[in-house]
């Protein structure tokens, strides 16, 4: 039995005390204006469509429509009792975008189109978004409009972030297959792109894909393997969007940063965080270029955005996303280093500069502070009981450090009789000494290790 809860009050004249569905007249299969309840709220009837007359004689308006008298007053039971006719008007007045990619003046028109579609045994039209198709619902006063500064940065820089893919040849068939991919960013309108050296190598064909899907063969112009920076070039007609390099030396701990990359065609991956340490005594990471500083951030850097830019909120590049060390700690090559590389690369290509040798042992390390030691101790139960020294994050294969027996998670506490408080101490000794007699804390043992640095090109 139908309830009368849906009826207008006071009750329309002539309504039964109790609704009896059996007394409801049969209804056509399709109603142009959609279904509605009769004046008594008992029977489902065909509602009048938008723009049709409504009121006591004409019957109710269809779903989502309301009966409005010429003065714009919704037709109540009182109006109907005066037998004053109104017009069916859509309760919603804003445009909507339908799943058929058409923009409808209001929700009611979309519903009418959906009913017509179903009558023709086609899929119903559903609402995809408020507002016209292809147009965002931008309310300049909305919170998301005001406060999505990260999205604003991404929108600004994304066109200059590229997807890089490397191809190799199969040995006999010589067919090319993809072997690796990474990201990069455009630094000159004529097609110079900066990426990580580990993303590209001379043995491979390098393909670059722009945000718009255009693909180009790239030539490797210059590589600094130790700093892990590479410069590649595409030939493009017209001007390309570029990213400007900011001053990494002016970065402050706590600044918002955005790491962006293009791990797949036509898609960007975005992570965000803050600067944890501005110029992490880069020597500390023990990367081959011992006099280089790194930016430490908690923005996640992974294979997807490796080689892509780390930017500040002005959209300036303040680093190249380069490596993830452990959960929550990632590093980027500072933009000041990129500037230096680009300047030197320009000089090298102009006059072929001589390069001085550097000493290298092959570890990535960081200074151990009491807070860092506590954090590591919480993470690894067998972490040594030390609060200072140089903590080894990684031992690079086929290096003097590996040959000497250094291992990941070791803490260097002294070299050649001098105590080691920070990773800088290790870097300084490497520069000066040809043999390093180290005391290393491993678990809760002290181990003697000898490492002989090798000379390499910077």
């Amino acid at each position: 039995q139908l309830s009368r809860a849906g009826r207008s009050a006071p009750l329309a004249a002539g309504c039964p005390d109790r609704c009896e569905p059996a007394r409801c007249p049969p209804q056509p299969e399709h109603c142009e204006g959609g279904r509605a309840r009769d004046a008594c709220g008992c029977c489902e009837v065909c509602g009048a469509p938008e723009g049709a007359a409504c009121g006591l004689q004409e019957g109710p308006c269809g779903e989502g429509l309301q009966c409005v008298v010429p003065f714009g007053v919704p037709a109540s039971a009182t109006v109907r009792r005066r037998a004053q006719a109104g017009l069916c008007v859509c309760a919603s007045s804003e445009p909507v975008c339908g799943s058929d990619a058409n923009t409808y003046a209001n929700l009611c028109q979309l519903r009418a189109a959906s009913r017509r579609s179903e009558r023709l045994h086609r899929p119903p039209v559903i609402v995809l978004q408020r507002g016209a198709c292809g147009q965002g619902q931008e309310d300049p006063n909305s919170l998301r409009h005001k406060y999505n500064f990260i999205a604003d940065v991404v929108e600004k820089i994304a066109p200059a972030v590229v997807h890089i893919e490397l191809f190799r040849k199969l040995p006999f068939s010589k067919r090319e297959v993809p072997v690796a991919s990474g990201s990069g960013f455009i630094v000159s309108e004529d097609g110079l792109i900066v990426t990580n050296a580990h993303v590209v190598t001379n043995k491979h064909r390098v393909k670059v894909e722009l945000k718009n899907g255009a693909t180009y063969e790239a030539k490797i112009k210059d590589v600094d393997e130790k700093a892990d920076i590479a410069l590649i070039k595409i030939d493009h007609q017209g001007k390309l969007p570029v990213l400007l390099l900011g001053r990494s030396s002016e970065l402050r701990p706590g600044e918002f940063v955005v790491a962006i990359g293009s791990p797949f065609s036509l898609q960007n991956t975005v992570t965000t965080g803050i600067v944890s340490t501005t110029q992490r005594g880069g020597k500390e990471l023990g990367l081959r270029n011992s006099d280089m500083d790194y930016i430490q951030t908690d923005a996640i850097i992974n294979y997807g955005n490796s080689g892509g830019p780390l930017v500040n909120l002005d959209g300036e590049v303040i680093g190249i996303n380069t490596l993830k060390v452990t959960a929550g700690i990632s590093f980027a090559i500072p933009s000041d280093k990129i500037k230096k590389f680009l300047t030197e690369s320009h000089d090298r290509q102009a006059k072929g500069k001589a390069i001085t040798k550097k000493k290298y042992i092959g570890i990535r390390m960081m200074s151990l502070t009491s807070s860092k030691a506590k954090e590591l101790k919480d993470r690894h139960r067998d972490f040594p009981d030390v609060i200072s020294g140089a903590y080894i994050i990684e031992v690079i294969p086929d290096t003097p450090a590996e040959a000497g027996g250094l291992k990941e998670n070791d803490v260097i506490i002294s070299i050649n009789g001098q105590s080691v408080v920070s990773a800088n101490d290790v870097s300084d000794v490497i520069k000066r000494e040809s043999t390093l007699n180290m005391v290393v804390r491993r678990g809760n043992e002290d181990i003697m290790i000898t490492v002989i640095p090798e000379e390499i090109d910077p």
């Epitope: 190799r168 199969l170 068939s173 067919r175 993809p178 072997v179 491979h204």
Partner: antibody, heavy 123, light 105 residues
């Protein structure tokens, strides 16, 4: 993980043919060439030939040219090696092995191997 | 065709010994590869691109050399290292050395 699973041991008469299969899993079958290497008792490993599963292109060791046919079925991720006109000196363990590739140096080697199929040729 | 000469063809050593195997080729090659094969098993890659350790291989194994002369070394022999070792080059097509059978004294 990458796995290459070969068909079982075979005993053949001289003059006959043998067809050994190798089912690959754990990687994109068409991104690597599949090679066949054999090892006669007490002998060194001997490369027989290879196939690019995507195109069906093959390369053979001249020593076996005309007697060996390598094929691949992309849809089944399976490679086959057929050796005809068998003689007693073809008694060996036959291995399928995937061509590996060094990203750093650009060199080629064999990184994954099947368990081997013993083919005995005896009258 | 490139000729490969691996030596010695067999050797006996004690646990903890340093073991060296050499491989010479008739023409200069870019890289050498080294495999270990245990009885009844398929070969297993140990060293690629002359000196790089394959994934999961203990650091006591190493490789060196260039051009026509290459060396494979086990710094401290372990009982589980008993096997036959093969060098392999890939010039116009892959060829293997005749193998070195390693036994424990």
């Amino acid at each position: 993980q990458v796995q290459l699973v070969q068909s079982g041991a075979e005993v053949k008469k001289p003059g006959a043919s043998v067809k050994v299969s190798c089912k690959a899993s754990g990687y994109t079958f068409t991104d690597y060439e599949m090679h066949w290497v054999r090892q006669a008792p007490g002998q060194r490993l001997e490369w027989m030939g290879a196939i690019d599963p995507e195109t069906g292109g093959t390369a053979y060791n001249q020593k076996f040219k005309g007697r060996v046919t390598i094929t691949a079925d992309k849809s089944a991720s399976t490679a086959y090696m057929e050796l005809s006109s068998l003689r007693s000196e073809d008694t060996a363990v036959y291995y399928c092995t995937r061509e590996g590739y060094s990203y750093e140096g650009g060199g080629y080697y064999f990184d994954y191997w099947g368990q081997g199929t013993l083919v005995t040729v005896s009258s | 065709d490139i000729q490969m000469t691996q030596s010695p063809s067999s050797l006996s050593a004690s646990v903890g010994d340093r073991v060296t195997i050499t491989c010479s080729v008739s023409s200069s090659v870019s890289y050498m590869y080294w495999y270990q094969q245990k009885p009844g098993k398929a070969p297993k890659l140990l060293i690629y691109d002359t000196s790089n350790l394959a994934s999961g291989v203990p650091s006591r194994f190493s490789g060196s050399g260039s051009g026509t002369d290459f060396t494979f070394t086990i710094s401290s022999l372990q009982p589980e290292d008993i096997a036959t070792y093969y060098c392999q080059q890939w010039y116009s097509y892959p060829t293997f050395g005749q193998g070195t059978k390693l036994e424990i004294k």
